[in-house]
Interface confidence: medium
Amino acid sequence: VPRWRQQWSGPGTTKRFPETVLARCVKYTEIHPEMRHVDCQSVWDAFKGAFISKHPCNITEEDYQPLMKLGTQTVPCNKILLWSRIKDLAHQFTQVQRDMFTLEDTLLGYLADDLTWCGEFNTSKINYQSCPDWRKDCSNNPVSVFWKTVSRRFAEAACDVVHVMLNGSRSKIFDKNSTFGSVEVHNLQPEKVQTLEAWVIHGGREDSRDLCQDPTIKELESIISKRNIQFSCKNIYRPDKFLQCVKNPEDSSCTSEI
């Protein structure tokens, strides 16, 4: 008789999840010499220990603490790039601008990027069939709690001028319900962070509107100002040219507005 299994609304654990995490860890520690001391088997054991045998709607930040410890890493606090709903461009940018970091450029973010995982209460099995959906099932699921934990701590680590890349093609350029809007904004530390600078990325070739005047950007400015952090905003009208000029800043066409 097949054992009854909880059916969740979200997709199941990513195929070959243990192998993927382990392989990513090994790759990351090879590329980043300052992390070569990391024992990837211990990292996997800590990752697994955060959610295996636990009810996937009852995960806490504390469950991830052993993993957090193993992922301890120096991040230049004045070189942090946050993003919301525009991950690919943010990552392309930090691949070119090597001294800036998104969360996914850190070991912990790199390990989990684009992956899904969950277990089952009281069994050592990984659930490859389905995992809880944040909206339809529960918010305290393994993936959501992981990202909330690392995002909060990443924002807490930021200092001086913090940059955030926002998607100007979306109806809500700043979304209070995104990880940036609900976690990172509220965990920037006013004692350390002087300015939050938003880069609003335009989608359309002919779009010359000033999206920094968008009501949701004004809402972000209000939230940030109330936290005693200065706010500034820039339109990035041509993201392709923007990236090109980051690669080749001496190019004569890069003196004009991007």
């Epitope: 957090m68 606090c77 200092c159």
Partner: nanobody, 119 residues
Amino acid sequence: EVQVLESGGGLVQPGGSLRLSCAASGFTFSSYGMHWVRQAPGKEREWVAVISYDGNTIYYADSVKGRFTISRDNSKNTLYLQLNSLKSEDTAVYYCALGAGSGPFFDNRGQGTLVTVSS
């Protein structure tokens, strides 16, 4: 502006002890986790220990566990690292660093203090 100033380094024989201090200013010291990290000549920076804002959560790197003790005095805005049973491989510049809670991300903000273990 966030500032940390490390002191207490020096030359010590193997098996000896030292106490490092880190004076912090420009932020509410009692609200932040603090780290010690070190960098040996020609090597990458290595994390040593972390203490949470209230002193209740402490972690050490395996290489120093049982020999080093991290502590803090929030009334003096000062972080400490007691180094016992020192070995030659502990020779490094020691930095105190402002953390986020109890990690995992931190930033080196000080000039460091040099610890040399040699006979």
